[in-house]
């Protein structure tokens, strides 16, 4: 699987999940988020050669097409597959509020 366990331990040029840390205050200007100060959002990048974690028959065909026709612009894209939520803490006045935000952390990628 093209997940963090594999991708973070290997120098992989093809489609893989890459580490990306986002600081809420410095990177996004969201000064009101109390905890965490930031988190690893991660992102997907890298080429999608034939049969690399193909998500659908279409992406398999597209990958083969691109392999046999290298000059073609059509090829599968490296996109998030599994995402996890992130829990944040902020204050409404002096009242703490905890929210779980869905699909915030990329854990694995796929070619689609």
């Amino acid at each position: 699987a093209l997940d963090t366990n594999y991708c973070f331990r290997n120098l992989e040029e093809n489609c893989c999940v890459r580490p990306l840390y986002i600081d809420f205050r410095q990177d996004l200007g969201w000064k009101w988020v109390h905890e965490p100060k930031g988190y690893y959002a991660n992102f997907c990048s890298g080429p999608c050669p034939y049969l690399r974690s193909a998500d659908t028959t279409h992406s398999t065909v597209l990958g083969l097409y691109n392999t046999l026709n290298p000059e073609a612009s059509a090829s599968p894209c490296c996109v998030p597959q599994d995402l996890e939520p992130l829990t944040i803490l902020y204050y409404v006045g002096r009242t703490p509020k905890v929210e779980q935000l869905s699909n915030m952390v990329v854990k694995s990628c796929k070619c689609s």
Epitope: G29, K31, W32, Y90, G93, R94, T95, L101
Partner: antibody, heavy 121, light 111 residues
Framework: EVQLVQSGAEVKKPGASVKVSCKTS????????MNWVRQAPGAGLDWMGQ????????NYNEMFEGRVTLTADTSTSTAYMELSSLRAGDIAVYYC??????????????WGQGTLVTVSS | DIVMTQTPPSLSVSPRETASISCRAS??????????MHWYLQKPGQSPQLLIY???NLESGVSDRFSGSGSGTDFTLRISRVEANDTGVYYC?????????FGQGTKLELK
Amino acid sequence: EVQLVQSGAEVKKPGASVKVSCKTSGYTFIKYWMNWVRQAPGAGLDWMGQIFPAWGSTNYNEMFEGRVTLTADTSTSTAYMELSSLRAGDIAVYYCARGYGNYALDAMDYWGQGTLVTVSS
Amino acid sequence: DIVMTQTPPSLSVSPRETASISCRASESVDSYGNSFMHWYLQKPGQSPQLLIYLASNLESGVSDRFSGSGSGTDFTLRISRVEANDTGVYYCQQNNEDPLTFGQGTKLELK
């Protein structure tokens, strides 16, 4: 230039609902909380609630008894306020206002021009 | 809810004089070293505009004739050398507690 442009005046019957829009431009919509404030004729300002457009988190003033619903469309940078079960006491000018940015509850540095909602049978 | 009481309800001032508006909160609006109190002016037929942020910080583009002071429960907005353009209703607002609340307003007019 930061701009908040609200939809036009509305006339509604008692018991109906009204939905007011607030189209923003000149800043990053998902970076700031959007507040809604109402002002009855000749009266002061009442905070109704707020929404964080990036993921739709909301905080409401309990005085509106769950009748208000705030939403946001990030594709058009537009915020919406819907008020249900309208009554005569809801006749007011409704404002959207951008939060200052340092806190969830905060001062409001840019305001829409206001939308007059009239309730009449 | 924190109740904000403004005095006086209305104020008539001669041009070039100084006007003072008070705002008293029903409980302290101070936290983490800040006073969570702000001031607005609503000119006739217009939307409110922010004048003072966090009790004493002048908002960008606002005349330095406006100044704010105070902490805890008692706050004051001062307008020096009052001009015709200063007429309208002034509101204080707190955000130290949910829900955010405003004062009832002080109407300033020129003599």
